[in-house]
């Protein structure tokens, strides 16, 4: 399990804000479900909570996770439940509210200050500030000027999809944003969460190619509903 604490990699060396609000509806990228970068500041309350049937976490909002409403209940009946706040018990990251992650069965803080760059990335389309200051160090985060002379090839860094060659889109890939191929039939894709809440995940995928849509994988029987794959399939 992810029992490690936020060490100096996480604190000092976050990916710089590369610009480009990737992962929003209508854009070329889709975020892979599961692990969110800490972010967001609205926490769902019981007052406005409306049960929503689900089969997996990605069908729920960022402030929710998919599970049986009763402890030890029928796994076949699952709804989107309000996320767990700090110091509450958890079994996986998705159960914890934004800004927290699951460590040793407890939701703990991810220290949002150190993730500010990632949060800002989803707010702005362009460089609001080309220096990011973390731990007192000022560092340039601009891309090489060569990026703008030729279209980016697969795997090269980008700011937005227009930086990439034909058949590629600009999508987050863990440390950075790179040009990735538009998805073909049978390839794993990401079904967007409800509420358009998919801007901060660490892996993003391009959209499915023409004539394809992202659907739950057929004949994909497994114990865990929460990690079923979606693939690009013919309409």
């Amino acid at each position: 399990t992810l029992n490690s604490v936020l060490n100096s990699n996480a604190i000092k060396n976050l990916p710089p804000p590369l610009g480009g609000a990737a992962g929003h509806p209508g854009s070329a990228v889709s975020a892979a479900p599961g692990i969110l970068y800490p972010g967001g500041n609205k926490y769902q309350t019981i007052d406005n909570y409306q049960p929503y049937p689900c089969a997996e976490d990605e069908e729920c909002g960022t402030d929710e996770y998919c599970a049986s409403p009763t402890r030890g209940g029928d796994a076949g009946v699952q709804i989107c439940l309000a996320c767990r706040k700090r110091r509450k018990r958890c079994m996986r990251h998705a159960m914890c509210c934004p800004g927290n992650y699951c460590k040793n069965g407890i939701c703990v803080s991810s220290d949002q200050n150190h993730f500010r760059g990632e949060i800002e990335e989803t707010i702005t389309e362009s460089f609001g500030n080309d220096h990011s200051t973390l731990d007192g160090y000022s560092r340039r985060t601009t891309l090489s000027s060569k990026m703008y002379h030729t279209k980016g090839q697969e795997g090269s860094v980008c700011l937005r999809s227009s930086d990439c060659a034909s058949g590629l889109c600009c999508a987050r890939h863990f440390w950075s944003k790179i040009c990735k191929p538009v998805l073909k039939e049978g390839q794993v894709c990401t079904k967007h969460r409800r509420k358009g809440s998919h801007g901060l995940e660490i892996f993003q995928r391009c959209y499915c190619g023409e004539g394809l849509s992202c659907r739950i994988q057929k004949d994909h029987h497994q114990a865990s509903n929460s990690s079923r794959l979606h693939t690009c399939q013919r309409h």
Epitope: L14, R92, A94, S144, Q153, F203, S226, S227
Partner: antibody
């Protein structure tokens, strides 16, 4: 075609230093993140470090943090790994790898032996 | 820490299909559906064979395919050939340590 050629490996005593280089060609070096991955004799692969295309971000494995420094010179299409305070357990073949969509191209590696 | 577990060895006869597993936890493989596979022949550099669960880079034979179910990712090689004999490694990322992680490797023997 993409080519990565490592150099600088050799025999060094515990506590010593070594600087590895990786000469890149066949692609726009300044547009890609680059990594070092090592493999101890008869063992599996271990990721060591990565550097962003413009050198603004660097990341390290816990096992080398504070001892190794990754850097690059885009004008020379070269990646570097400065290794200080070397230990016997750092003995390995060190590979330079392009980090496009994952580690999509690798060099042939350079052997670093730390022994007294 | 994230740990990806692979069988130490797998074997098969020419023409057969074999599957190599890579098991993580709900926090990594089961959580964010991302895994890659590398092939390494003795004395050679690793080669990317599969990325993002089931995508093949150009130049990789379609005999190699990837899949994932729950916390386990799999690499399947169909129509096994002598040149497939090599070590295979799965790889993912640790979002807490912001690092890349490799599985322990699986030695494939073609009988």
């Amino acid at each position: 075609q993409v080519q990565l050629v490592e150099s600088g490996g050799g025999l060094v005593q515990p506590g010593g230093s070594l600087r590895l280089s990786c000469a890149a060609s066949g692609f726009t070096f300044s547009s890609y993140w680059m990594s070092w991955v090592r493999q101890a004799p008869g063992k599996g692969l271990e990721w060591v470090s990565v550097i962003s295309s413009d050198s603004s971000s660097t990341y390290y494995a816990d096992s080398v943090k504070g001892r190794f420094t990754i850097s690059r010179d885009n004008s020379k299409n070269t990646l570097y790994l400065q290794m200080n305070s070397l230990r016997a357990e750092d003995t390995a073949v060190y590979y330079c790898a392009r980090h496009g969509i994952d580690f999509d191209h690798w060099g042939q590696g350079t052997l670093v032996t730390v022994s007294s | 820490d994230i740990a990806l577990t692979q069988p130490a060895s797998v074997s098969g006869s020419p023409g057969q299909s074999i599957t190599i597993s890579c098991t993580g936890t709900s926090s990594d493989l089961g959580g964010y559906n991302y895994v890659s596979w590398y092939q390494q022949h003795p004395g050679k550099a690793p080669k990317l064979m599969i990325y993002d669960v089931n995508n093949r880079p150009s130049g990789v034979s379609n005999r190699f395919s990837g899949s994932k179910s729950g916390n386990t990712a799999s690499l399947t090689i169909s129509g096994l050939q002598a040149e497939d004999e090599a070590d295979y490694y799965c790889q993912t990322y640790d979002q807490i340590k912001l690092s890349a992680v490799f599985g322990g490797g699986t030695k494939l023997t073609v009988l």
